[in-house]
Interface confidence: medium
């Protein structure tokens, strides 16, 4: 999916008002310095591509983020403010519901969510130069 035509300011508002709090809740009890940010993004569409990938694609050691509240709100925000996004997700979601996994918080998931926090921070500050 090409995130170029999303309403970035509305997605930012959704992140600041609710998604960010869910990410903090998920990470509660973890030191902010515990994980190094290794995933970066260069502009807002790229950030959303990376955010979608980390949030919804199962990875080795962390297969269960898609049913977390921050993930469902992320999907909602993308579907609302990215034209055509929901159509691209329907088949994938129906398949995911059929093989629904129980939520498990592993260290790998915590690391992944830490990376997500960094991507969202970058998304919110698009004019900052890449370090």
């Amino acid at each position: 999916y090409d995130f170029t035509n999303c309403d970035f300011e509305k997605i930012k508002a959704a992140y600041l008002s609710t998604i960010s709090k869910d990410l903090i809740t998920y990470m509660s009890g973890t030191k902010s310095t515990e994980f190094n940010n290794t995933v970066s993004c260069s502009n807002r569409p790229h950030c959303l591509t990376e955010i979608q990938s980390l949030t919804f694609n199962p990875t080795a050691g962390c297969a269960s983020l898609a049913k977390e509240m921050f993930a469902m709100k992320t999907k909602a925000a993308l579907a609302i403010w990215c034209p055509g996004y929901s159509e691209t997700q329907i088949n994938a979601t129906q398949a995911m519901k059929k093989r629904r996994k129980r939520k498990v918080t592993t260290n790998k998931c915590l690391e992944q969510v830490s990376q997500l926090q960094g991507l969202w921070r970058r998304f919110n500050r698009p004019l900052l130069k890449q370090q």
């Epitope: 609710t18 709090k21 469902m72 909602a76 519901k97």
Partner: nanobody, 113 residues
């Protein structure tokens, strides 16, 4: 498969109030983000607001301060309380879960004097 049924629409005068309900079956609301959209005649479907199972809400600018979304998980029902209604709120209102293809059939709200 989740099925959604909206109710509570009708004709109301400007400045009036309505409460819409969205009853879900085949799934439980505490697993979902539940949203409300609306579609006015000849216009595209427009986001109204959503509620997470944690109770957090998000609203479109056009309804903020006038509309309130709530949910009763024990009844598997979400609500849209609409106050200070305006003629431009006239539309068919739909509820949906997680924007994944599950939509209700909609309920018509007409704001007119």
């Amino acid at each position: 498969e989740v099925q959604l049924v909206e109710s509570g629409g009708g004709l109301v005068q400007p400045g009036g109030s309505l409460r819409l309900s969205c009853a879900a079956s085949g799934g439980t609301l505490d697993d979902y983000v539940m949203g409300w959209f609306r579609q006015a005649p000849g216009k595209e479907r427009e986001f109204v607001g959503f509620i997470g199972s944690d109770g957090s809400t998000l609203y479109a600018d056009s309804v903020k301060g006038r509309f309130t979304i709530s949910a009763d998980n024990s009844k598997n029902t979400a609500y849209l309380q609409m106050n200070s209604l305006k003629p431009e709120d006239t539309a068919v209102y739909y509820c949906t879960t997680e924007w994944d293809g599950y939509w209700g059939q909609g309920t018509l709200v007409t704001v007119s004097s």
